[in-house]
C-alpha cells in the first residue's frame, strides 16, 4: 500500500478549494487539526476539515446528486413532455375539425336545422374535449344527449314543419320517443361504441404520458437519506480533508455507494419497463375504432347517415309519434 | 389516400369531400414516440452506473480514494474499505424505497394495469349485431369499423391515418426530437409538425 502523502502543513490548498464552494474562509482551519468532532470524514491523523465544512460538503453532495439525476433525465423528460404537448394539441385540433365537419354537414344538407344543431354539436364536442383531458363524463350520456337534442329539431323542422316553434311540451315527449322508438336505428349505439372506445384509448394514452412525466419528475427531485448524504460526502469530499484534491474515488467504490443510495430508484425499473411495453401495446392497437382521429373525423358522415335513416322512415315515425305525443300536441294547439 | 371534408359544399345534394395529404400522421408519430421511449427502457437500472461515470471517478489513475485512504485502483481495498465501520450499506438497502417512490410505483402499477386492459388484442373480433334492432337495419356493414364514414348518398369513407395536421405546423421538426441527427433547413422548421 502506498504511503499517504504528507498532509498540507498549512491547509492552504484546502482553503482555496473550499472557497469555491463557500466564499468566506472562516470554516477552514489554518493548520491541520485533530478533527475529533468530525462525523463523516473520520480522520486517521490531522485534518484540514471542520464540522461546518463537513456539513457544507454534505449539502453540496446532495445538490450534485440532484443535478446529475436531472441531467441524466433531460432527454427523456423532453421527449415525453414534448410529445404529451403535441398530442394534446393535436387531439384538440382533431376535435375542432370534427366539430367543423359536422357543422358543415348540417349547413350544407340540413340548413333548417343549423342554429340549434350547431349548439348541440358544439356541446357534444366540448364534452369530448373534456373527456379526453380526464373529466368525469359518461360517453354514452354524451351521445344520447346529442341525439335526444337533435331529434325534436329534426321532427319539427324536417318531418313535421307545420308545428309551432314553441313546442316545448312536445320536445320532452320527442326526446323520450327517440329512445323508445329507436328513431335513429342503431346509429347512436354505433357512435357510442366507436366514440367510447376511441376516446378511452386516447384518454389513457395522454394519462400515461403525463404519468411518465410525473415519474421522471419524482426521481429528479428525490430527497436522499442522511446515510446516503454521508456516503456521498465521504466518497466525493473527504479526500480534500487530507489535502488530496486531485484524487478521484475508486470506480468499484462509487458503484457500491450508488447502488446503496439509489436502491429505491432502481426498484422503479421493473415497472418502468412494463410501462413502456404496455404503452407500446396500446399504441399498436390504436387504429380503426380505437383511433380517435379516424372515428371523430368520420362522425359527420355517420350522423348524416343517421338523419337519412330517420327521413327514410319518416312516414312510419310521424304516425307513431303523432299517437305517442298526441297529448302534448293537443295542449300545444289550444 | 385519406378523405376528409376540408372544403364542404353542396353539389346536387351530394357532400363533396376534398382531401389533403401530409407526410406524417398521429399514428406514425405515436409509433415513433414508442421507438424512442424504448431506447430509455433501461433508464432506471442504468442510473447508478451513469452517475458514477459522470462524476469524477478514477479511470486512468493508478491510485484512487476508497472513502478512507488512497489505495491502488485494482486492490481489494478499492471497494471494500470505504464502507467499513461507517454505515451498514445492507441496512440502507433494506429500508426500502421512500414514500414518494412507493407512491409512484403504485401509480405505475395502476397505469400498467389500465394500459393492458385497454390494449386491443391482435385479431379481436369487433362487436357485431349492431343492426338487429330499430325500424330497419342501418346502412352499415356487419363490422362496425366499416361504418366510419357511412355509406350515405355520395359519402366518402374516412380512412384511417388522416393526414391533415398541417394546422399544427409549428416547427416540431427533425431537430426537435431526441434521437434524430439529421439537419433541418429553416423551411423544414415551418412546414409541418408531423414529418419527423
Amino acid at each position: 500500500q502506498p504511503p499517504p502523502p504528507p498532509p498540507d502543513a498549512t491547509c492552504h490548498q484546502v482553503r482555496s478549494f473550499f472557497q469555491r464552494l463557500q466564499p468566506g474562509l472562516k470554516w477552514v482551519p489554518e493548520t491541520p487539526v485533530p478533527g475529533s468532532d468530525l462525523q463523516v470524514c473520520l480522520p486517521k491523523g490531522p485534518t484540514c476539515c471542520s464540522r461546518k465544512m463537513e456539513e457544507k460538503y454534505q449539502l453540496t453532495a446532495r445538490l450534485n446528486m440532484e443535478q446529475l439525476l436531472q441531467s441524466a433525465s433531460m432527454e427523456l423528460k423532453f421527449l415525453i413532455i414534448q410529445n404529451a404537448a403535441v398530442f394534446q394539441e393535436a387531439f384538440e385540433i382533431v376535435v375542432r375539425h370534427a366539430k367543423n365537419y359536422t357543422n358543415a354537414m348540417f349547413k350544407n344538407n340540413y340548413p333548417s336545422l343549423t342554429p340549434q344543431a350547431f349548439e348541440f354539436v358544439g356541446e357534444f364536442f366540448t364534452d369530448v374535449s373534456l373527456y379526453i383531458l380526464g373529466s368525469d363524463i359518461n360517453v354514452d350520456d354524451m351521445v344520447n344527449e346529442l341525439f335526444d337534442s337533435l331529434f325534436p329539431v329534426i321532427y319539427t323542422q324536417l318531418m313535421n314543419p307545420g308545428l309551432p316553434d314553441s313546442a316545448l311540451d312536445i320536445n320532452e315527449c320527442l326526446r323520450g320517443a327517440r329512445r323508445d322508438l329507436k328513431v335513429f336505428g342503431n346509429f347512436p349505439k354505433l357512435i357510442m361504441t366507436q366514440v367510447s372506445k376511441s376516446l378511452q384509448v386516447t384518454r389513457i394514452f395522454l394519462q400515461a404520458l403525463n404519468l411518465g412525466i410525473e415519474v421522471i419528475n419524482t426521481t429528479d427531485h428525490l430527497k436522499f437519506s442522511k446515510d446516503c448524504g454521508r456516503m456521498l460526502t465521504r466518497m466525493w469530499y473527504c479526500s480534500y480533508c487530507q489535502g488530496l484534491m486531485m484524487v478521484k474515488p475508486c470506480g468499484g467504490y462509487c458503484n457500491v455507494v450508488m447502488q446503496g443510495c439509489m436502491a429505491g430508484v432502481v426498484e422503479i425499473d421493473k415497472y418502468w419497463r412494463e410501462y413502456i411495453l404496455s404503452l407500446e401495446e396500446l399504441v399498436n392497437g390504436m387504429y380503426r375504432i380505437y383511433d380517435m382521429e379516424n372515428v371523430l373525423l368520420g362522425l359527420f358522415s355517420t350522423i348524416h347517415d343517421s338523419i337519412q335513416y330517420v327521413q327514410k322512415n319518416a312516414g312510419k315515425l310521424t304516425t307513431t309519434i303523432g299517437k305517442l305525443c298526441a297529448h302534448s300536441q293537443q295542449r300545444q294547439y289550444r | 389516400s385519406a378523405y376528409y371534408p376540408e372544403d364542404l359544399f353542396i353539389d346536387k345534394k351530394v357532400l363533396k369531400v376534398a382531401h389533403v395529404e401530409h407526410e406524417e400522421t398521429l399514428s406514425s408519430r405515436r409509433r415513433e414516440l414508442i421507438q424512442k421511449l424504448k431506447s430509455f427502457i433501461s433508464f432506471y437500472s442504468a442510473l447508478p452506473g451513469y452517475i458514477c461515470s459522470h462524476s469524477p471517478v478514477a479511470e486512468n489513475d493508478t491510485l484512487c480514494w476508497n472513502g478512507q485512504e488512497l489505495v491502488e485502483r485494482y486492490s481489494q481495498k478499492a471497494a471494500r474499505n470505504g464502507m467499513k465501520n461507517q454505515f451498514n450499506l445492507h441496512e440502507l438497502k433494506m429500508k426500502g424505497p421512500e414514500p414518494v417512490v412507493s407512491q409512484i410505483i403504485d401509480k405505475l402499477k395502476h397505469i400498467n394495469q389500465l394500459l393492458r386492459t385497454m390494449s386491443v388484442p391482435k385479431g379481436r373480433v369487433l362487436d357485431k349485431n349492431l343492426d338487429e334492432e330499430g325500424f330497419e337495419s342501418g346502412d352499415c356493414g356487419d363490422d362496425e369499423d366499416e361504418c366510419i364514414g357511412g355509406s350515405g348518398d355520395g359519402m366518402m369513407k374516412v380512412k384511417n391515418q388522416l393526414r391533415f395536421l398541417a394546422e399544427l405546423a409549428y416547427d416540431l421538426d427533425v431537430d426537435d426530437v431526441p434521437g434524430n441527427n439529421q439537419q433541418a433547413t429553416p423551411k423544414d422548421n415551418e412546414i409541418s409538425t408531423f414529418h419527423n
Epitope: M74, E75, A85 | H54, L172, P178, G179
Partner: antibody, heavy 119, light 112 residues
Framework: EVQLQQSGPELVKPGASVKISCKTS????????MHWVKSSHGNILDWIGY????????FYNQKFKGKATLTVDKSSNTAYMELRSLTSEDSAVYYC????????????WGQGTLVTVSA | DVLMTQTPLSLPVSLGDQASISCRSS???????????LEWYLQKPGQSPKLLIY???NRFSGVPDRFSGSGSGTDFTLKISRVEAEDLGVYYC?????????FGGGTKLDIK
C-alpha cells in the same frame, strides 16, 4: 416563423424587483422549455434556469436560486422571469430562449431585455 | 459545475484568414444518452447570440459551411476557414450535457 419578443428595458432601484416577459409565437409553446440567460459586462454569459410551460417544471442554476423566479402563462404563450432584491450586480441584458433537447439545446433567442439597477 | 475554458480571449485576424477557437471542459461532457451537447454561438454587438454549431460538429440551418466544429470528451474546436466581415463578434462555447449548463468566457474575433 419562430419568434420570441421580450419586454422593454427596465430602470429599477436597488432592493426592488422586476418582472420581464418573453412572448412567443410560431411554435407549440407547451412542447418546448423556455430558458433564460444573463449577459453581463465583459462578455460573460450565465445560464439562469429553465421552465417547461407544459407543467411548470423548472430547474435553477444554484447561483440564481432565490434571485430569479420563472413562470409561464400558457394562455398567452408568454414566459416570465422575476428578479428580486436587485443590486448593481444584477444590471445586465437578460435573454429568453426556446429550449429543444435532443439535438441542440437552444436555437432561438429573444432580443434581450436590459435591466439597469441604479439609485 | 462544469467549467468551460475558451482560448484565446481575443483573436485578431485578417479577412480571408482561417481562425481557430479552442474550448476545454473541466470534465467530460458526454451525456448519459451518448450525445455531447457542445454548442458554439456567435454574438454580434447589440444582438442576441446565434447558434452556429450543435452537438460538437453539426451546423445549424443557414450557417455557412466555412464554420466547422470538432472535438470530443473535453477538448473542442471551432474553425472558420475564411473569415468574412460578418463573422466578427464574440464566440461562445456552451455545454448542455450537465446541469447547470455553462458557457465559456468568450473569444472576441476582430480585424488585425
Amino acid at each position: 416563423e419562430v419568434q420570441l419578443q421580450q419586454s422593454g428595458p427596465e430602470l429599477v432601484k436597488p432592493g426592488a424587483s422586476v418582472k420581464i416577459s418573453c412572448k412567443t409565437s410560431g411554435f407549440l409553446f407547451t412542447g418546448h422549455y423556455m430558458h433564460w440567460v444573463k449577459s453581463s459586462h465583459g462578455n460573460i454569459l450565465d445560464w439562469i434556469g429553465y421552465i417547461y410551460p407544459y407543467n411548470a417544471i423548472s430547474f435553477y442554476n444554484q447561483k440564481f436560486k432565490g434571485k430569479a423566479t420563472l413562470t409561464v402563462d400558457k394562455s398567452s404563450n408568454t414566459a416570465y422571469m422575476e428578479l428580486r432584491s436587485l443590486t448593481s450586480e444584477d444590471s445586465a441584458v437578460y435573454y429568453c430562449a426556446r429550449g429543444d433537447y435532443g439535438n441542440y439545446v437552444t436555437a432561438y433567442w429573444g432580443q434581450g431585455t436590459l435591466v439597469t439597477v441604479s439609485a | 459545475d462544469v467549467l468551460m475554458t475558451q482560448t484565446p480571449l481575443s483573436l485578431p485576424v485578417s479577412l480571408g484568414d482561417q481562425a481557430s477557437i479552442s474550448c476545454r471542459s473541466s470534465q467530460s461532457i458526454v451525456h448519459s444518452s451518448g450525445n455531447t451537447y457542445l454548442e458554439w454561438y456567435l454574438q454580434k454587438p447589440g444582438q442576441s447570440p446565434k447558434l452556429l454549431i450543435y452537438k460538437v460538429s453539426n451546423r445549424f440551418s443557414g450557417v455557412p459551411d466555412r464554420f466547422s466544429g470538432s472535438g470530443s470528451g473535453t477538448d473542442f474546436t471551432l474553425k472558420i476557414s475564411r473569415v468574412e466581415a460578418e463573422d466578427l463578434g464574440v464566440y461562445y462555447c456552451f455545454q448542455g450535457s450537465h446541469l447547470p449548463w455553462t458557457f465559456g468566457g468568450g473569444t472576441k474575433l476582430d480585424i488585425k
